[in-house]
């Protein structure tokens, strides 16, 4: 069980498993056919730089060079898209930095990148007004790189409308996905804008495109898809976040935890609070409110936004992270100034890793 | 084909403890879960607790929290069920069941569903 | 925790009958739901997982439907093997919880 009381207050469990996961996002770079794509690898420390796309080790070519830590694509084709990855090799372990690259006519692409949720428009699916397809949560589309340990079942979901109402099919690597294309083959739900793989396995891994389509338009929207088959490590933390804060009585403020993961990994922020003017149960344990954690009614876990704060909410916050590994925290403090006083950097405190554990 | 064989139930008195074993063959025992599910004599079906195969993280229901254990030997392709502090509401059939996760990549959780089920067990706890 | 509501309790029907149980979550588990039969002394089997997916192996009368609290179970013919005690179960939040089961006895 974690080393800490819990005030009464707080209803999350947290030596329970998350039923949400959550991995960061890695960046996309999007080039026009024809262009040239530089990317450099967002690592410290590397002393030697391995790279790869969708999981296949990347060599020099023709039109791909690779010198140090940056990495150039010549003449992008279509082809160019995927998931990459750069990985730094230490003495003592090794580090990853995904990116994905999307080459394609932004024009004609049909992407969701610039797309509304169309909840704003107010129009009747029965009426007359004829309508091109459109995702209804774009927000629940972001995430796009999903890692799932082998032998699990992975559910792929495209929620759109239109007038009238659109089709959906699935593409895996740009192209048709067939039944026979896997044992087993897949199932698809329509009404739910679904697409399920039960017991999934390496072979398994790539993009996975659905395509949403009327008379009207046309939508598509990727996926990738990673099959975890490796020992998942212990979440890692983004060094430098959450990143010390300070602000005026009734200012508001943000800390970001940024979170990467091969297993579900469980966001928790907690905050040291007093208890009948104690910080400290009576098992010497020190009491820790929980304040925000993922969950399946729970925005974005990896941030956690305080607003129009009071000299009470000054002090440490701690982004604990938790899989069925094990876990890491890193913190930051809040310092809450006089209305009178400008807000200025802190000095960085880090907690040990093992502060939690 | 996969086959879960559950074994060590019996009669325990009130305050005793129990050790019950599923032994799994048939799938990589690694990559899913272990849940055990209970039914006491004529009523309903009640979820006890889970563990991820992969290094034997668990979970409970709140009715067994601190008196009952799950852990499993990989090498032996066994999950077991330590069940201490017995009292007479712990008598049932006990079922070790497969779990495995479905990731919903739009909503963002994950569903765990029990497909392959032992043959059961019965405890009961009476003096 | 969250509670599951079976309805009905029990109900009679002949073989060719058209069956539905509905089961009713006390907040939403969006599609998380799974349906299980349970022959008496046996362990339960696997029908339906997320709603409305059909487990592999499971006849195609056997059919679920809903999201969010309201969910349903269809059998489009009953057959002899499938009087049984018919059980839903959500998995979204923790713990997991089974509704108190329908019976479908022979009329």
């Known amino acids: 069980r974690p080393s800490f009381s819990l005030v009464e207050d707080t209803t999350l469990e947290p030596e329970e498993p998350p039923t949400k996961y959550q991995i960061s996002q890695p960046e996309v770079y999007v080039a026009a056919p024809g262009e040239s794509l530089e990317v450099r690898c967002l690592l410290k420390d590397a002393a030697v730089i391995s790279w790869t796309k969708d999981g296949v080790h990347l060599g020099p070519n023709n039109r791909t060079v690779l010198i140090g830590e940056y990495l150039q694509i010549k003449g992008a084709t279509p082809r160019d898209s995927g998931l990459y990855a750069c990985t730094a090799s230490r003495t003592v372990d090794s580090e990853t930095w995904y990116f994905m690259v999307n080459v394609t006519d932004a024009i004609s692409s049909g992407d969701d990148e610039d797309d509304t949720d169309g909840a704003e428009d107010f129009v009747s699916e029965n009426s007359n007004n004829k309508r091109a397809p459109y995702w209804t949560n774009t927000e629940k589309m972001e995430k796009r790189l999903h890692a799932v340990p082998a032998a699990n079942t992975v559910k792929f979901r495209c929620p759109a409308g239109g007038n009238p109402m659109p089709t959906m099919r699935w593409l895996k690597n740009g192209k048709e996905f067939k039944q026979e294309h896997r044992i087993g083959g897949y199932k698809v739900r329509n009404q739910h804008w679904s697409l399920i793989m039960e017991s999934v396995v390496p072979s398994d891994k790539g993009n996975y495109t659905c395509v949403v389509e009327n008379e009207y338009g046309s939508i598509n929207h990727t996926y990738h898809l990673d099959v975890v088959e490796r020992s998942p490590h212990r979440p890692i933390l983004q060094a430098g976040l959450p990143a010390n804060a300070s602000t005026v009585v009734g200012g508001d403020v943000e800390f970001v935890c940024k979170v990467y993961s091969d297993a579900q990994p469980h966001i928790q922020w907690i905050k040291h609070v007093e208890k009948n003017g104690s910080k400290y149960g009576p098992d010497g344990l020190p009491y820790l409110k929980v304040l925000k954690h993922s969950g399946i009614n729970s925005s974005n876990a990896e941030v956690l936004a305080l607003f129009n704060v009071t000299e009470a909410d000054a002090g440490e916050y701690i982004c604990k992270v938790s899989n069925y590994i094990g876990q890491a925290n890193q913190s930051a403090w809040l310092t809450v100034l006089p209305k009178q006083q400008a807000p200025g950097r802190e000095k960085e405190i880090t907690a040990s890793p093992d502060y939690l554990e | 084909e996969v086959q879960l064989v559950e074994s060590g139930g019996g009669l325990v008195q009130p305050g005793g403890s129990l050790r019950l074993s599923c032994a799994a063959s048939g799938f990589p025992f690694t990559s899913t879960g272990i849940s055990w599910v209970r039914q006491a004599p004529g009523k309903g079906l009640e979820w006890v607790g889970r563990?991820?195969?992969?290094?034997?993280?668990?979970n409970y229901a709140d009715s067994v929290k601190g008196r009952f254990t799950i852990s499993a030997d990989t090498s032996k392709n066994t999950a077991y069920l330590q069940m201490n502090s017995l009292r007479a509401e712990d008598t049932a059939v006990y079922y070790c069941?497969?779990?495995?996760?479905?990731?919903?990549?739009?909503?963002?959780?994950?569903?765990?569903?029990?497909?392959?089920w032992g043959q059961g067990t019965l405890v009961t706890v009476s003096s | 925790d969250i509670q599951m509501t079976q309805s009905p309790s029990s109900l009679s029907a002949s073989v060719g009958d058209r069956v539905t149980i509905t089961c009713r979550a006390s907040q939403d588990v969006d599609t998380s739901l799974a349906w299980y039969k349970q022959k008496p002394g046996k362990a339960p089997k696997l029908l339906i997982y997320?709603?409305?997916f059909l487990y592999s192996g499971v006849p195609s009368r056997f059919s679920g439907s809903g999201s969010g609290t309201d969910f349903t179970l269809t059998i489009s013919s009953l057959q002899p093997e499938d009087f049984a005690t018919y059980y839903c179960q959500q998995s979204t939040g923790h713990p997991q919880t089974f509704g108190q089961g329908t019976k479908v006895e022979i009329k």
């Open positions: 997320s709603a409305s």
């Open positions: 069941a497969r779990t495995y996760g479905i990731y919903d990549t739009y909503d963002m959780y994950t569903e765990y569903v029990m497909d392959y």
């Open positions: 563990t991820h195969l992969g290094d034997g993280s668990t």
